[in-house]
């Protein structure tokens, strides 16, 4: 008769047998039968299983391709895969991380809000009034225009969002 | 409370017959195979028997084959040992085991233990 | 049958120390070993399942490791209650077979 309840975690039932599933790092090579219990084998090099499984292949470590732009970021174990990220200046273009693409730069009249990572692209932001940016960069945020009068100077031409204010000395001849 | 009591035990003549029992509480019963296991006296773990939920699997150690015999009750939550023609060899603390598989008595291991009934063999 | 052999059987240690306990069978039996502990007068309990897969409840300072033939288990800082007498015990094959215990003393 079969069990009055499936069977346990980590088992599964066969031939009316609940047999243990193979632990995480290994895999299946036998059923286990009433007088012997699962037959497991651990992966071998550059392979692995993150679960209980009853799986008869390990699957293979990811590759981390250079020529993608890929390094490795975490070395796979029996038990997890590789974890692959991008070289530095460069993003994941999904979660999985198959491929690199180079960090986006701001234009100028634009600064960093947030600087990419090996997972996300730079995060760009218009510069609002009283900021600048004159390059085009993947780092430098907005900067605030000269003040003058703390220089004892005034402002010769006004600033954008591309550049900065001019400062000038006072007029002395004005009444 | 999960638990596991055992009673029978005592003393007894070489040749007789003992029955020792197990109540079983605080789980489901009949979802896991059960166990016997025994302790000489100063001695190391012995596995004597084994029992599936259904009782279609039923195994026992050589030394206490053809005179043992396993049995369940699941009505009544508890386990038995049968044990005649008695030897001194037979001395031991005896042991109620669950295991946390169903299907087979033939092997396991045991995740809760009764606190044990000592059977003693002897003139 | 499968015989397991276990060592030392005796090892003298104090609160603190870092305790291993070998456990060898005579057949390959994957990663089908259980180890218990046991203290004087009590039952058996299980530690360790699955040679590495520590049992619920159990204090994370208890390991174990090993595949094949080979098994340790480890404590990793030894307390006053770890005192007791430890058994591997292999489930891979009919029928389930015991080491001969280690016992763990005060020194």
């Known amino acids: 008769p079969e069990p009055p309840t499936a069977c346990r975690e980590k088992q599964y039932l066969i031939n009316s047998q609940c047999c243990s599933l193979c632990q995480p790092g290994q895999k299946l090579v036998s059923d286990c039968t009433e007088f012997t219990e699962t037959e497991c084998l651990p992966c071998g090099e550059s392979e692995f299983l993150d679960t209980w499984n009853r799986e008869t292949h390990c699957h293979q470590h990811k590759y981390c391709d250079p020529n993608l732009g890929l390094r490795v970021q975490q070395k796979g174990t029996s038990e997890t895969d590789t974890i692959c990220t991008c070289e530095e200046g460069w993003h994941c273009t999904s979660e999985a991380c198959e491929s690199c693409v180079l960090h986006r730069s701001c234009s100028p009249g634009f600064g960093v809000k947030q600087i990419a990572t090996g997972v996300s692209d730079t995060i760009c932001e218009p510069c609002p009034v009283g900021f600048f940016s004159n390059v085009s960069s993947a780092f430098e945020k907005c900067h605030p225009w000269t003040s003058c009068e703390t220089k004892d100077l005034v402002v010769q031409q006004a600033g954008t969002n591309k550049t900065d204010v001019v400062c000038g000395p006072q007029d002395r001849l004005r009444a | 409370e999960v638990q596991l009591v055992e009673s029978g035990g005592g003393l007894v003549q070489p040749g007789r017959s003992l029955r020792l029992s197990c109540a079983a509480s605080?789980?489901?019963?009949?979802?896991?195979?059960m166990h016997w296991v025994r302790q000489a006296p100063g001695k190391g773990l012995e596995w004597v028997s084994g029992?599936?939920?259904?009782?279609?699997?039923?195994h026992y150690a050589d030394s206490v084959k053809g005179r043992f015999t396993i049995s369940r009750d699941n009505a009544k939550n508890s386990l038995y040992l049968q044990m005649n023609s008695l030897r001194a060899e037979d001395t031991a603390v005896y042991y109620c085991?669950?295991?946390?598989?169903?299907?087979?008595?033939?092997?396991?291991?045991?995740?809760?233990w009764g606190r044990g009934t000592l059977v003693t063999v002897s003139s | 049958d499968i015989q397991m052999t276990q060592s030392p059987s005796s090892v003298s240690a104090s609160v603190g120390d870092r305790v291993t306990i070998t456990c060898r069978a005579s057949?390959?039996?994957?990663?089908?070993l259980a180890w218990y502990q046991q203290k004087p007068g009590k039952a058996p309990k299980l530690l360790i399942y699955?040679?590495?897969y520590l049992e619920s409840g159990v204090p994370s300072r208890f390991s174990g490791s090993g595949s094949g033939t080979d098994f340790t288990l480890t404590i990793s800082s030894l307390q006053p209650e770890d005192f007791a007498t430890y058994y591997c015990?292999?489930?891979?094959?009919?029928?389930?077979?015991f080491g001969g215990g280690t016992k763990v003393e005060i020194k």
């Open positions: 605080g789980f489901t019963f009949d979802d896991y195979a």
């Open positions: 057949k390959v039996i994957s990663s089908w």
């Open positions: 085991a669950k295991d946390p598989t169903a299907t087979t008595g033939a092997r396991g291991y045991f995740d809760l």
């Open positions: 015990q292999q489930h891979s094959s009919f029928p389930p077979t």
């Open positions: 029992i599936s939920w259904s009782s279609d699997s039923i």
């Open positions: 699955a040679a590495s």
